[in-house]
């Protein structure tokens, strides 16, 4: 488990998890990622989104040395996006279909972010969402942007856990 | 950098329709909505409804409900605003903008045509 | 009938502070959605000045400041300048009317 004090994670636990949400993030919005959404001079808005970049540490060299910084940064992401999919973006209407696989995506992201930061240890947890009343008729826009955006987060933090499990799990 | 341009002024009678063009040039409006305001010579600005290209849905305010009608053609990304059984009350300045959002916030109408001048008169 | 109330029009002098209510209801501003600031110029489309109640566009100078409160938002212009004198109003999504709603607007004369 990667415990704010240092300790290892469970690579390969955390690995099999990951990959279950890419699973997950492709199959609750699979049309997302053939469509070209390029936005122009979004700066304001891309700020307010966890990513995971060169100096958050999950380089292979960044993870050997420490990987507590990757692994924080990838947390704080997990709790971002577990966020808004449990708001009214995703509860609201129009009504998910009875079959979505958001449900099971809204648990995986707690799942392993619990795996990443167990009962009674705390990482800041910057980046959390504040989040007004969304409005209806663009709620689908939101999901659609939502499900992009955590596609290729999740499929960054599966790489990540994928290099650690072959090459740092004990 | 977006800009949004309309189609040119009309005159139009009681009782017919016109049809508003906006055309996005210098990129697309996929991953946005669209909205049309109006206003009236010398009076405030009043939202009609949006439209979300993408996924060919509409939202219109509750008073045009039924008279307006907007559509969009991702192929040439230009939307279009359509307003029915004219009234000499419907004279005014109407305008496009993009509706932009974030992840999760509403980020506003950042960037307006230029507007299209209705005249409604016998 | 918008549902956003504003003052019909405010002034100040040069370099002055000068500030704007938005007043909603328990179905708008009241329910916790963003308000949105624009400024129009006569004869020209609205600009874009605050979004998310309090936040400003890149470009819009540190001036324009907005806030907000229960019911109501504000806009505060500091150090009033000849170019501010315009047409002002805030905008809300109204969930009792499906859609946004614009204020009735507030002009802003520089003495």
């Known amino acids: 488990r990667a415990v704010p004090g240092g300790s290892s994670p469970a690579w390969t636990q955390c690995q099999q998890l990951s990959q279950k949400l890419c699973t997950l993030a492709w199959s609750a919005h699979p049309l997302v990622g053939h469509m070209d959404l390029r936005e122009e001079g979004d700066e304001e808005t891309t700020n307010d989104v966890p990513h995971i970049q060169c100096g958050d540490g999950c380089d292979p060299q960044g993870l050997r040395d420490n990987s507590q910084f990757c692994l924080q940064r990838i947390h704080q992401g997990l709790i971002f996006y577990e966020k808004l999919l449990g708001s009214d973006i995703f509860t609201g209407e129009p009504s998910l279909l009875p079959d979505s696989p958001v449900g099971q995506l809204h648990a995986s992201l707690l799942g392993l972010s619990q795996l990443l930061q167990p009962e009674g240890h705390h990482w800041e947890t910057q980046q959390i969402p504040s989040l007004s009343p969304s409005q209806p008729w663009q709620r689908l826009l939101l999901r659609f942007k939502i499900l992009r955006s955590l596609q290729a987060f999740v499929a960054v933090a599966a790489r990540v856990f994928a290099h650690g499990a072959a090459t740092l799990s004990p | 950098k977006v800009q949004l341009v309309q189609s040119g002024a009309e005159v139009k009678k009681p009782g017919s329709s016109v049809k508003v063009s906006c055309k996005a040039s210098?990129?697309?409006?996929?991953?946005?909505?669209i909205s049309w305001v109006r206003q009236a010579p010398g009076q405030g600005l009043e939202w009609m409804g949006g439209?979300?290209?993408?996924?060919?849905?509409?939202n219109y305010a509750q008073k045009f409900q039924g008279r307006v009608t907007i559509t969009a053609d991702e192929s040439t990304s230009t939307a279009y605003m359509e307003l029915s059984s004219l009234r000499s009350e419907d004279t005014a300045v109407y305008y496009c903008?993009?509706?932009?959002?974030?992840?999760?916030?509403?980020?506003?109408?950042?960037?307006w045509g230029q507007g299209t001048m209705v005249t409604v008169s016998s | 009938q918008s549902v956003l109330t504003q003052p019909p029009s405010v002034s100040g002098a040069p370099g002055q502070r000068v500030t704007i209510s938005c007043t909603g209801g328990?179905?708008?501003?009241?329910?916790?959605?963003?308000v949105q600031w624009y400024r129009q110029l006569p004869g020209i489309a609205p600009k874009l000045l605050i979004y998310?109640?309090?936040n400003r566009p890149s470009g819009v100078p540190a001036r324009f400041s907005g806030s907000k409160s229960g019911a109501s938002a504000s806009l505060a212009i500091t150090g009033l300048q000849a170019e501010d004198e315009a047409d002002y109003y805030c905008?809300?999504?109204?969930?009792?009317?499906?859609?946004?709603?614009f204020g009735t607007g507030t002009k802003v004369t520089v003495l």
């Open positions: 328990s179905s708008s501003i009241g329910a916790g959605y963003d």
């Open positions: 998310r109640s309090t």
């Open positions: 905008v809300s999504y109204d969930s009792s009317l499906g859609g946004y709603v």
């Open positions: 210098g990129g697309t409006f996929s991953s946005y909505a």
């Open positions: 903008a993009r509706d932009r959002t974030s992840l999760y916030y509403y980020y506003g109408m950042d960037v």
């Open positions: 439209f979300i290209p993408i996924f060919g849905t509409a």
